[in-house]
């Protein structure tokens, strides 16, 4: 039985130009954590794995770093990076758990976080 | 080349257990999950578990959970898997295959072994 | 678990003809979908990966598409050696499910 919890950075902006860390945090299971996959709608960007650390895929390697923790900055944000970005938290027993986020990329100077939110 | 060589042909009764031996090769062996899969005689195939031969860290399918144990031996790249308590519909062909590209699940497994009959009879 | 439905189960083809076969999941799974080539006596070979990237060194008339939990993957031109049986794979979530399987025989 699926018990946990995803907490995510819900809805965020940015500048273009500038960078933003995507975050999401498991809570309230006592699974082991195998792998978090991070997706930008249908694109893999990123896989950190317990055991054998992150992989990043060759076609973000120059604008996505690994981190802070299981979390992913992206890094020379453009208008195209708007959009919804998913991390896939790959646990066992449970099986896996998924949180979303959506990032608006401002041309503007003024962008603001979003608050957090819970996805069950 | 990259290979996964598995040990032969196995006869065992009821109530045994079965050790099938999975043999890495021509790659880094600590680099890549290994899953074991098996078909059973004209059956398609199912996922059994899978085990990292960095940590020797584990996940098996509820299917067979106090039944099965992978193992591994980095020293002689070789993983294992141990099956408990055979019945007859165990009765298959039991598969190693690496998961590709350093990571779980995404890239699928793009490595198999030859495969090991496995014979449960009275 | 995540059930994945093949269809057809089989099916018979000619050499040069176009084929199609499709895995539907139950659930959502995103694009965590593999096929895989099987031929008797073999173990299988990974044709396609996350439901549309072709493996290194498989043949290009081998291609995979993905509409929400609906999967296909398609022979553009049969060739004798593509008379096999071929699954499809989740692993989006475990345990790891594969669909019944589609053998595609000689008509």
């Known amino acids: 039985m699926m018990t946990g919890t995803i907490e995510t950075t819900g809805n965020i902006s940015a500048e273009k130009g500038g960078s933003i860390i995507l975050q999401c945090h498991l809570s309230s299971t006592t699974a082991q954590v195998t792998q978090v996959n991070w997706e930008q709608q249908d694109q893999l960007l990123a896989i950190c794995n317990a055991d054998l650390g992150w992989h990043i895929s060759p076609s973000f390697k120059d604008r996505v770093a690994p981190g802070p923790g299981l979390g992913l900055t992206l890094q020379s944000l453009t208008v195209n990076d708007t959009g919804e970005y998913f991390c896939i938290y790959h646990t066992y027993p449970d099986g896996t758990y998924t949180g979303r986020i959506f990032l608006e990329v401002l041309e503007s100077s003024v962008a603001e976080h979003g608050a957090r939110f819970q996805i069950p | 080349q990259v290979q996964l060589v598995q040990s032969g042909a196995e006869v065992k009764k009821p109530g045994a257990s079965v050790k099938v031996s999975c043999k890495a090769s021509?790659?880094?062996?600590?680099?890549?999950?290994i899953h074991w899969v098996r078909q059973a005689p004209g059956q398609g195939l199912e996922w059994m578990g899978w085990?990292?031969?960095?940590?020797?860290?584990?996940g098996y399918a509820q299917n067979f959970q106090g039944r099965v144990t992978m193992t591994r031996d980095t020293s002689i790249t070789t993983a294992y898997m141990e099956l408990s308590r055979l019945r007859s519909d165990d009765t298959a062909v039991y598969y190693c295959?690496?998961?590709?590209?350093?990571?779980?699940?995404?890239?699928?497994?793009?490595?198999w072994g030859q495969g090991t009959t496995v014979t449960v009879s009275s | 678990d995540i059930e994945m439905t093949q269809a057809p189960s089989s099916l018979s083809a000619s050499v040069g003809d176009r084929v199609t076969i499709t895995c539907r999941a139950s659930q959502t799974i995103r694009r965590y979908l593999n096929w895989y080539q099987q031929k008797p006596g073999k173990a299988p070979k990974l044709l396609i990966y996350a439901a549309s990237s072709l493996q290194n060194g498989v043949p290009s008339r081998f291609s995979g598409s993905v509409s929400g939990t609906d999967f296909t993957l398609t022979i553009s031109s049969l060739q004798p050696e593509d008379f096999a049986t071929y699954y499809c794979q989740q692993s989006y979530s475990t345990p790891l499910t594969f669909g019944g399987g589609t053998k595609v025989g000689i008509r």
């Open positions: 085990i990292s031969p960095t940590s020797g860290a584990t």
């Open positions: 295959a690496r998961d590709s590209n350093s990571v779980l699940y995404y890239y699928g497994m793009d490595v």
């Open positions: 021509g790659y880094t062996f600590t680099g890549y999950y």
